[in-house]
Interface confidence: medium
Amino acid sequence: LECYSCVQKADDGCSPNKMKTVKCAPGVDVCTEAVGAVETIHGQFSLAVRGCGSGLPGKNDRGLDLHGLLAFIQLQQCAQDRCNAKLNLTSRALDPAGNESAYPPNGVECYSCVGLSREACQGTSPPVVSCYNASDHVYKGCFDGNVTLTAANVTVSLPVRGCVQDEFCTRDGVTGPGFTLSGSCCQGSRCNSDLRNKTYFSPRIPPLVRLPPPEPTTVASTTSVTTSTSAPVRPTSTTKPMPAPTSQTPRQGVEHEASRDEEPRLTGGAAGHQDRSN
C-alpha cells in the first residue's frame, strides 16, 4: 500500500506542494489522515498527520469543548493507494460578527498561544490578548495547556494559551480519536505564563483557619471550620460532542454542522493565528 505522508503543526507541512508518498510496511492495509483544529476566541490553528495507518477503514469526527476552547477532530482511514487526501486541512479565518466594538474587553488579559511553537510560547514571551465575553459566556479565566494529535505512528503537539470560561480548572482535558486537549485555568490577568505545576487548591476553597489555643478557664469553642481538598465542583463532564464544522465563527448561538469539504482537491495547509476581532 502507498499512502500520502505529511505532518502539519499549525504550519504548511501538509500544503498542496509539500505532499510526499510513502510505501507502507507489509501487513499495513490502511492509509490514515487526521486533523485536529483548536479554536480560541482569538484565533484557531490545526494539527494534521497523513501516513500509513492501522485498524479498519472508516471515519470518525468529533467536536469537543474545554471551558470555551473548541476542538474539532476528523480521522479518516481508507484502504486504497494514496486515498488519504480527502480532508480539508485548512484552518479558516474566523469571521468576526462585526467590528471589535461588538466584543468589548472584560478587563482580563491572558497570554495567547494560537499556533505558536513551544519555543515561542514560553513564560511571558507570547502575545497578550484582551478577553471578552461572547455568546452569553464569560471568558474571565486564562488557560495554559497542550493539544496533541497521534496518527500514523506520529505524535504532534503544540501549546495552547488563551481566554477561557473557567478560572479554576486544574489539569483538565478532553479527548477524541487520537486527540487530547488538556491544561489548567487560572484567575487574574496574565496568570497563565506557566500552569504546568498547578495544584488542586483554588481561591474557591475556604482557607485553613488556625484557631487560637483555648483559654484554660473557658469551654472550647464549638465553631467548626470546614476545609476541602477536592477540586471545585463543575459539571461532571466538560466534553460536549459536536459534529465538526465547515468554518468557525464567533460563538453567538452558532449551530455547528457536519463538515462538507467544498473543494476536496484544494486541501491547503493550515492558517496561522487568525484573530476573531479586526
Epitope: P16, N17, A271
Partner: antibody, heavy 117, light 112 residues
Framework: EVQLLESGGGLVQPGGSLRLSCAAS????????MSWVRQAPGKGLEWVSY????????YYADSVKGRFTISRDNSKNTLYLQMNSLRAEDTAVYYC??????????WGQGTLVTVTS | QSVLTQPPSASGTPGQRVTISCTGS?????????VHWYQQLPGTAPKLLIY???KRPSGVPDRFSGSKSGTSASLAISGLRSEDEADYYC???????????FGGGTKLTVLG
Amino acid sequence: EVQLLESGGGLVQPGGSLRLSCAASGFTFSNAWMSWVRQAPGKGLEWVSYISSSGSTIYYADSVKGRFTISRDNSKNTLYLQMNSLRAEDTAVYYCAREGLWAFDYWGQGTLVTVTS
Amino acid sequence: QSVLTQPPSASGTPGQRVTISCTGSSSNIGAGYVVHWYQQLPGTAPKLLIYDNNKRPSGVPDRFSGSKSGTSASLAISGLRSEDEADYYCAAFDDRLNGPVFGGGTKLTVLG
C-alpha cells in the same frame, strides 16, 4: 470554468517597481493556495512565491526574497505580486497559478515584465 | 542550472513512443515528494499534464503516463501525434529550497 487573468506587466527601469494582479474566478479563491511562476524569454519555468489560502503562510524563492511581496485579497478574489528593486534578470512572463492537489492545476495566460534601461 | 535535470530535447515520429526523463536528488524526488509534469505548447501558458507521479487530470489522453523511482521520474508519450510537439517540464517540491522546483524543460519535436 476556472479562470486566472494577470495584469500589471510592462516596461520598467532597473531599480523600479511594478505591481502585478491576478483576478481569479470559477472556483472558491479563499480555499486555494496560489503561486507566482515566471519564465524568462526562451528559458524554463521558475517558481517565484506562494501564499496559503488565508494569506498567513508565505514563501519566496531566494532570487526574489526581500524584493518581492506576495499578497491576496480574498474579498476581491485577487492575488498580487509587488515587485521592487527590479533587475534585468527579472525580465520574464509572470504567471499566476492555482495549487490544486499537489500541483499547479490552473495557470493564467501570463503578463510580460521587461526590465531594461 | 535547474535543480531537476531533463534532456534539452527529444524527438520521435508519429505513432512512436517517447520517454522523457527527470532526475532529482535526495532533497526533492528522492525525499518522497510527488512529481508533476507540465506541457507548454508554443506561445501558451503551461498546462498540467501529470500530477502526483502518475495521475492524469481530466481531459488528458491516456497516451500520457508518468512514473517515479528513487530520485528520478519519467514521462512516457505513446502513439505520438504532431500536436504533442511542445516543451515538457517536470516539477517537485524541494526541502532545501523550501519551494517547488522545475526541470529545465525538454523540447519535443515530432518528425515527419
